[in-house]
Interface confidence: low
């Protein structure tokens, strides 16, 4: 079994990158974004069992304390480790503008 | 109340810094750490309701999609925004050493 990267809960259950297709309406952006009309939102979804993709020492501590005190300390959480930029064409008072967002789409994931 | 920082679930329910007292045995460190014998572990615990302490655009998107597809997209999660360093006195083959860990204690929290 892989140290730190084998999912003990069964295939596909642990923290990894997923894509969710969303319209501007879904995102609440229809009033200020022109394009794209639909976004492939990459996000981190899945469980973080013991030491799976632990981001750092804090995540390791959290796992240990969650095992001891599950009602007090939550398990680590699956969150982005880094992001991919995305360009939105936005509505402005004078027309349109291109804006790059660096923190919109998850690139890869870890547990923290 | 500050926009994005008012907890609609009631005082203390939302994402914030907590301290959990843990022994070296609790942490599984007894075989390699000499001191401190007990650690005041600061960690981020609490709910992340709509737009509460949203770390970035990704967190805002996650909130929107969680509202639409709660079975598919999880709510944002309360995680450290930054860390405080901590010095551990470790056992070595020849005696002891001081080691600073930069990613051990949460300093402040946000939702992502």
């Amino acid at each position: 079994a892989r140290n730190g990267d084998h999912c003990p809960l069964g295939p596909g259950r642990c923290c990894r990158l997923h894509t969710v297709r969303a319209s501007l309406e879904d995102l609440g952006w229809a009033d200020w974004v022109l394009s794209p009309r639909e976004v492939q939102v990459t996000m981190c979804i899945g469980a973080c069992p013991s030491q799976f993709r632990a981001a750092n020492m804090h995540a390791q501590i959290k796992t240990s304390l969650h095992r001891l005190k599950p009602d007090t300390v939550p398990a680590p959480c699956c969150v982005p480790a880094s992001y991919n930029p995305m360009v939105l064409i936005q509505k402005t008072d004078t027309g349109v503008s291109l804006q790059t967002y660096d923190d919109l789409l998850a690139k890869d994931c870890h547990c923290i | 109340a500050r926009n994005g920082d008012h907890c609609p679930l009631g005082p203390g329910r939302c994402c914030r810094l907590h301290t959990v007292r843990a022994s070296l045995e609790d942490l599984g460190w007894a075989d390699w750490v000499l001191s401190p014998r007990e650690v005041q572990v600061t960690m981020c615990i609490g709910a992340c309701p709509s737009q509460f302490r949203a770390a970035n655009m990704h967190a805002q998107i996650k909130t929107s999609l969680h509202r639409l597809k709660p079975d598919t997209v999880p709510a944002p999660c309360c995680v450290p925004a930054s860390y405080n360093p901590m010095v551990l006195i470790q056992k070595t083959d020849t005696g002891v050493s001081l080691q600073t860990y930069d990613d051990l204690l949460a300093k402040d929290c946000h939702c992502i």
Partner: antibody, heavy 117, light 107 residues
Amino acid sequence: QVQLQESGPGLVKPSETLSLTCTVSGFSINRDCYWIWIRQPPGKGLEYIGYTFYSGITYYNPSLASRTTISRDTSKNQFSLKLSSVTAADTAVYYCARDCDYAMDYWGQGTLVTVSS
Amino acid sequence: DIQMTQSPSSLSASVGDRVTITCRASQDISNYLNWYQQKPGKAVKLLIHYTSTLHSGVPSRFSGSGSGTDYTLTISSLQPEDFATYFCQQGNTLPWTFGQGTKLEIK
């Protein structure tokens, strides 16, 4: 024994929609794995098209996303690929596969789709 | 996308030879590297996943190693059934991407 079998027309006209189905036996597609489409143009490397996951999540390679739809029919234990507005560049052997733990452990034999008028 | 560069693109060898195929990623892929075998008209077979873990039923003459960006597939003693095309694939960052393949032929 897990088996996957691709089916669909071998010839599609330019600008039309390519439609393929993958029939899975020996394992329920309603379980945890990712169900994937991959293609290989003649004489070229493999290209990942995308997946469908049991929870209803899909992923499409950004280079093909605007033309791609992957869906599931759990009652028939099948998943499907639709690729719209095809051109000659979409001529390839199309494979379906299963990804259970960051690797594709079972593949279909592949089906050649030619785009030509 | 992560680019996977595989070498050599073709290789002639004899039964009993030791063969090594390499794969280089354009960025660190954290050991999420898989190796596959492809034969004409047959389904692709997974040989090795996560750099070095042999898939069930794969002979022990196949082995994998590497870390970071550089990975290797080794066949310790070639058998007649091993002549095929081999390709690597990274599973660290979507979209998963593949090497161009190495065609292993009989000398």
